[in-house]
């Protein structure tokens, strides 16, 4: 998947663009909005009818090196009595994000953009049964 | 990717931190993931805390299209298909990294940007604050 070029109908490439070798792009990894914080309701992972746990994955050759993944605790959903109800299903909600991967080749290093699918949390759904004979 | 020679004395002198600016290949790994949540699953309709998906488009950003979830109800859908206000539908938010064209309009120069997206909704027991 290549990054699309700027559409000519929208705007022309300015003269101020930095020179970039063919087949590559310049990427500044000083993050815009670095200090922005998620303002989700408190403890929703425990209060949800489809609760989840978090696992931190760490990779020194990835930027950011820390990626948090959620895992649904149950197959079913938690009912009003606090019991797992298997007539409903807990399912993961996923979102893509970008990371920069550092690759070592001998004494050289290269950088590659990578799409990572992050499981963000879980939701409770009515199951679908496909009748396949 | 684009190869950058390491410092003399490699591998011991390798910098553990990422440099501020890197040259990266235009090809993105794991391109086979589906970017349209409506096509990848119908959880948004089948959930007890259903949500609508809104398209957010910005040509100065990669990916240029991001889908934002908005919970349909304040409450959750019960077994009878009615909205139960004893429970709450709340958005699940996630910080993601995108590419922002910098300087603006440049085709091959970007900066990482952190944005907050609502990915879907989940049904939670509300927190009731007892005020004396």
């Amino acid at each position: 998947r290549k990054i699309p070029k700027v559409g000519h109908t929208f705007f022309q490439k300015p003269e101020s663009c930095p020179p970039v070798p063919g087949g590559s792009m310049k990427l500044d990894i000083g993050i815009i909005n670095e200090n922005q914080r998620v303002s989700m309701s408190r403890n929703i992972e425990s209060r949800s009818t489809s609760p989840w746990n978090y696992t931190v994955t760490w990779d020194p050759n990835r930027y950011p090196s820390e990626v948090v993944q959620a895992q649904c605790r149950n197959l079913g959903c938690i009912n009003a009595q606090g019991k797992e109800d298997i007539s409903m299903n807990s399912v993961p909600i996923q979102q893509e994000t970008l990371v920069v991967r550092r690759k070592h080749q001998g004494c050289s290093v290269s950088f590659q953009l990578e799409k990572v699918l992050v499981t963000v949390g879980c939701t409770c759904v009515t199951p679908v049964i496909h009748h396949v004979q | 990717g684009i190869t950058i020679p390491r410092n003399p004395g490699c591998p011991n002198s390798e910098d553990k931190n990422f440099p501020r600016t890197v040259m990266v290949n235009l090809n993105i790994h794991n391109r086979n993931t589906n970017t349209n949540p409506k096509r990848s699953s119908d959880y948004y309709n089948r959930s007890t805390s259903p949500w609508n998906l809104h398209r957010n488009e910005d040509p100065e950003r990669y990916p240029s299209v991001i889908w934002e979830a908005k919970c349909r109800h304040l409450g959750c859908i019960n077994a009878d298909g009615n909205v139960d206000y004893h429970m709450n539908s709340v958005p699940i938010q996630q910080e993601i990294l995108v590419l922002r064209r910098e300087p603006p309009h440049c085709p091959n120069s970007f900066r990482l940007e952190k944005i907050l997206v609502s990915v879907g909704c989940t049904c939670v027991t509300p927190i009731v604050h007892h005020v004396a």
Partner: nanobody
């Protein structure tokens, strides 16, 4: 294509036991989850037991909790439902189902009839 074949049903007296088996032919079970549901004439379909493959998490319907046990034998590519202290209300056709992804279930075969007499 994977076909699920249920067996082990039959007629049993109240208080008795049965062990249902579900075999996967033409492939292996889905990597996500496997479960059993039942359908009695004129009644709604009811999931009775489910098992998640990644961590062997199991869960049961309230109506069978403590009496039924779902288990698997990976080597034999078989999932079992051990049913004990059976009641007349457990009478139904029992189907084995496999989850290809969370929230979605597929089943094959005709199921197996369980009849509990009083």
């Amino acid at each position: 294509e994977v076909q699920l074949v249920e067996s082990g049903g039959g007629l049993v007296q109240a208080g008795g036991s049965l062990r249902l088996s579900c075999g996967a032919s033409g492939g292996t079970f889905s990597s996500y989850a496997t479960g059993w549901f039942r359908q009695a004439p004129g009644k709604e379909r009811e999931f009775v037991a489910v098992l998640r493959w990644s961590d062997s998490h199991t869960a049961y319907a309230d109506s069978v909790e403590g009496r039924f046990t779902i288990s698997r034998d990976g080597a034999k590519n078989t999932v079992y439902l051990q049913m004990s202290s059976l009641k007349p209300e457990d009478t139904a056709i029992y189907y084995c189902t496999t989850g290809t992804r969370p929230g979605e279930w597929h089943y094959w075969g005709q199921g197996t009839q369980v009849t509990v007499s009083s």
